[in-house]
Amino acid sequence: SIPWNLERITPPRYRADEYQPPDGGSLVEVYLLDTSIQSDHREIEGRVMVTDFENVPEEDGTRFHRQASKCDSHGTHLAGVVSGRDAGVAKGASMRSLRVLNCQGKGTVSGTLIGLEFIRKSQLVQPVGPLVVLLPLAGGYSRVLNAACQRLARAGVVLVTAAGNFRDDACLYSPASAPEVITVGATNAQDQPVTLGTLGTNFGRCVDLFAPGEDIIGASSDCSTCFVSQSGTSQAAAHVAGIAAMMLSAEPELTLAELRQRLIHFSAKDVINEAWFPEDQRVLTPNLVAALPPSTHGAGWQLFCRTVWSAHSGPTRMATAVARCAPDEELLSCSSFSRSGKRRGERMEAQGGKLVCRAHNAFGGEGVYAIARCCLLPQANCSVHTAPPAEASMGTRVHCHQQGHVLTGCSSHWEVEDLGTHKPPVLRPRGQPNQCVGHREASIHASCCHAPGLECKVKEHGIPAPQEQVTVACEEGWTLTGCSALPGTSHVLGAYAVDNTCVVRSRDVSTTGSTSEGAVTAVAICCRSRHLAQASQELQ
């Protein structure tokens, strides 16, 4: 019967006793940078071309015995997971292997860099269809390796990497920490994070999504018909490389940003038990398990958005944190979060011709995160409208005054350290949805966008009694672009988007008195694009 991992990534409409997805990724070439492989294994024979590229360090130890089947083990298994004719994800994809890991599975940054350059040159000499590069390896943080990945990604190549098996923050490793790379953590048959001995899958904001990575059956280099189970984030990354190959084969014009957004959109949501992750990493780690789209076409009409968390600002008084969207994405809103609750809000600002989201720490604060809502919005023209702190007691307000511009997000930022303490909440007048409101001491920033057919609406959920968390979700067909809390709730730690839900977090209710200040209101801005919907109908 179908292996658990293939069943897990397959939408229900394709499920059968045999895994037979509609398109096998035949238009895509997948480059594998790993160990040597046994290319005559019947699972991958004729599907994998072994290039003459080899750049590996000497094996450690004078008594090391180089045994071909052991040298080939990791790479052969991964090639099988990506494109194996029986237990592979993208059964139609062709692969090319480059040897950058030795028989002990060790490599060097320089070897990987030269391998990436080899791929770039191959692409220039003989351009083919879409390229996916699988990097099932992880080492310490390397600025130079991340930069090389960025260059290749900007040349139109999709890079997929393992998050690492160190039960640690993936941002401490490369290439996992490179923003342009799709970084994959590992889950098991119970959708739980994979434990590997005393360690396990990496986690954190640098992980884009998770995929099956425990007890994965695949080609074994022991013999031509042998199969074996292996576990790790390499196996998880191989699944995503296969899914990416399938998506790109169905839609070869997809950009990296579009592919990443689709991978996130079609993932299974909120199935991972977050208790496995360290407490401070739970909010930062995406609760997503990769899956194939239910249909390889017809997703183009949706407005895709994702949440991008910044690195932690650090605790100094004037510390800031910045979250950035990918080059092809629009920043539609900006929010902030602090575990201590001491923060000075956030604002959208231009940096290098592109909007970024900056969060500000407050005196006595342990630090903040900036949270960007990054969306795919073709032909968008977005700007930020700012209102300085108001004199009036009604608070600060700002709206989108340009014709055809709609409100996609609200941010507020203040200079005073104790904003909102002992002050009554500011209520937003009804019937003015295209407007952001805030404390009179705060400057308010409205993200206003014009794009063909874009329409947005505000949705609120208020709870009069104190709650640790208040949420409001956008309904089917609408996408969450903005997430914020109504001002006046002094104990708010911050707001952030999780998939299509706006989450407003407050201090532990046991430490806050249930006064009127306990009221918490989460505000979601939900958008959709009629233009994209019509365009997809015309294409079909």
């Epitope: 037979q20 024979e45 059964k91 022991d222 013999c223 199969f227 074996v228």
Partner: antibody
């Protein structure tokens, strides 16, 4: 039920061409390998090669490479073994058998096709 | 190629007696990654195609009587018929299925004494 049904016996002259067939039913034909096995009169079993109908991947025994061609038409769940120019030494019983990727031994066999090549 | 050698070439056993067939491979067919022996046994009766009896050296195929058993590991294997029945008269073949080309033993003919 799961079965492989082979085409009937053939009597041919040396130099003639021939294509024999093996039709699978009762299972997902594209997800199993089909092997061809020769048994010359009074002799043992010799593995000739296999095909994976899902993508028409083939692997031949070097002893048979260039002597025969293995193919498949997945739309009709049928595998083929063909000769472009028969020899008297090709006289034998030919069996098709299926095997699964995770159980790479032949669990189901066709009834066999007797090929006689004689002038 | 992995050469499979069976012994004896033929064997005559009384009804109800034990029949033992040996098979030796020229290289090990036991693989450490899954600790399995890639060896099968087939039975072929006159005028019939071969029938799978044993796989992974010792796992009996469903529907095969329990008087048939397989043992051995690495390079040396045995097929045992614990109590020979009249319907067991046939030629028995071992096969390695780990490496291309797949190879069979030359066969052992089992008859009733």
């Amino acid at each position: 039920q799961v079965q492989l049904v082979q085409s009937g016996a053939e009597v041919k002259k040396p130099g003639e061409s021939l294509k024999i067939s093996c039709k699978g039913s009762g299972y997902s034909f594209t997800n199993y390998y089909i092997s061809w096995v020769r048994q010359m009169p009074g002799k043992g079993l010799e593995w000739m090669g296999l095909i994976y109908p899902g993508d028409s991947y083939t692997h031949y025994n070097p002893s048979f490479q260039g002597q025969v061609t293995i193919s498949a038409d997945k739309s009709i769940s049928t595998a083929y073994l063909q000769w472009s120019s028969l020899k008297a030494s090709d006289t034998a019983m030919y069996y098709c058998a299926r095997d699964h990727w995770y159980k790479p031994f032949s669990d189901i066999w066709g009834q066999g096709t007797l090929v006689t090549v004689s002038s | 190629d992995i050469v499979m050698t069976q012994s004896p070439d033929s064997l005559a056993v009384s009804l109800g007696e034990r029949a033992t067939i040996n098979c030796r491979s020229s290289q090990s067919v036991l693989y450490s990654s899954n600790n399995k022996n890639y060896l099968a046994w087939y039975q072929q009766k006159p005028g019939q195609p071969p029938k799978l009896l044993i796989y992974w050296a010792s796992t009996r195929e469903s529907g095969v009587p329990d008087r048939f058993s397989g043992s051995g590991s690495g390079t040396d294997f045995t097929l045992t018929i614990s109590s020979l029945q009249a319907e067991d008269v046939a030629v028995y073949y071992c096969q390695q299925y780990s490496s291309f080309p797949i190879t069979f033993g030359q066969g052992t003919k089992v008859e009733i004494k």
